[in-house]
Interface confidence: low
């Protein structure tokens, strides 16, 4: 039951967090956590990399023309997120949600 609840909350909140709080003032901890999540789980976006198109930061001039954060890159270099190309972007089917689900299943059951 706990797993089901956690799973539901993750699905509901991860996209909101990524789109509204990533790289926003006062949300440095969230930004760092999302970057770490994408790098450690080799994923990009909540459901897929396209989710980042809705991000306030990605839409702003502060993003420097990136279409995804640099933490989506397989090899992270400055501004690597400007090219949303499978050769260097984690294009995992199901995005970070799927990776997190798997992790939770393995560690909480």
């Amino acid at each position: 039951a706990y797993y089901q609840q956690l799973n539901t909350e993750l699905k509901e909140n991860l996209k909101d967090t990524m789109t509204k709080r990533y790289h926003q003032p006062g949300h440095e901890a969230v930004t760092s956590a999302v970057d770490q999540l994408q790098q450690e789980f080799h994923c990009c976006g909540s459901n897929n990399s396209q989710d980042w198109r809705d991000s306030e930061w990605i839409r702003s001039q502060e993003a420097g023309g990136r279409v995804v954060p640099d933490s989506c890159c397989k090899t992270v270099v400055a501004l690597c997120g400007q090219r949303d190309h499978a050769s260097n972007i984690y294009k995992v089917e199901g995005g970070c949600i799927t990776k997190l689900e798997t992790f939770i299943q393995e560690h909480l059951r």
Partner: antibody
């Protein structure tokens, strides 16, 4: 079918507080991605964005008016409110509310607008 | 704030004309630009979003183009019902609108 309708006092005096209500149907602010903005337009002039409220109660304000603005919502009643303190004749305008669906196909554009409510500040 | 400049306040047109309304952003806004049409006594209506995407039900004579700082709304075959004010808007950061361009008959 999405509809929005603004209501307000019509006329008020300088230094008073303007209270506006946006009543909407066809969507709910409990849905992720939904947001409502307030925009105003003095007669014969351009549009000025005032404030925005997100589904999760996060708020954004026009920096030049921020100290005078308060936006809020009643999700259960499908209403969004805007208060403007210390009004002046320069606040005379038609006030619109508009929907923004952040996760929809139309990105952050304002896809549905209310008919507007006319507000006159006069002594 | 990002300033959106519509340099033409008024444009004289005739039916059948090709009309181009321009809008310039004071800084790079990517493609985060929308265009609205407003007829007298009415609220604005969304025509174009993400710089070049036509909103549902908008006739295909309306076309949006541009990215970065320069944007254009083109009406390829001007109709009398297109006489209205047209506003550009950026939503790269806090939304700001252009001052508007009014289409009039010659």
């Amino acid at each position: 079918q999405v509809t929005l309708k603004e209501s307000g006092p019509g006329i008020l005096q300088p230094s008073q507080t303007l209270s506006l209500t946006c009543s909407f149907s066809g969507f709910t602010l409990s849905t992720s991605g939904m947001g409502v903005s307030w925009i105003r337009q003095p007669s014969g002039k351009g549009l000025e964005w005032l404030a925005h409220i997100y589904w999760d109660d996060d708020k954004r304000y026009n920096p030049s008016l921020k100290s005078r603005l308060t936006i809020s919502k009643d999700t259960s009643r499908n209403q969004v409110f805007l208060k403007i303190t210390s009004v002046d004749t320069a606040d005379t305008a038609t006030y619109y509310c508009a929907r923004r669906d952040h996760y929809g196909d139309y990105s952050y554009a304002m896809d549905y607008w209310g008919q507007g409510t006319s507000v006159t500040v006069s002594s | 704030d990002i300033v959106m400049t519509q340099s033409q306040k008024f444009m004289s047109t005739s039916e059948g004309d090709r009309v181009s309304i321009t809008c310039k952003a004071s800084q790079n806004v990517g493609i985060a630009v929308a265009w609205y049409q407003q007829k007298p006594g009415q609220s604005p209506k969304l025509l174009i979003y993400s710089a070049s995407n036509r909103y549902t039900g908008v006739p295909d004579r309306f076309t949006g183009s541009g990215s970065g700082t320069d944007f254009t709304l083109t009406i390829s075959n001007m109709q009398s019902e297109d006489l209205a004010d047209y506003f550009c808007q950026q939503y790269s950061s806090n939304p700001t609108f252009g001052a508007g361009t009014k289409l009039e008959l010659k």
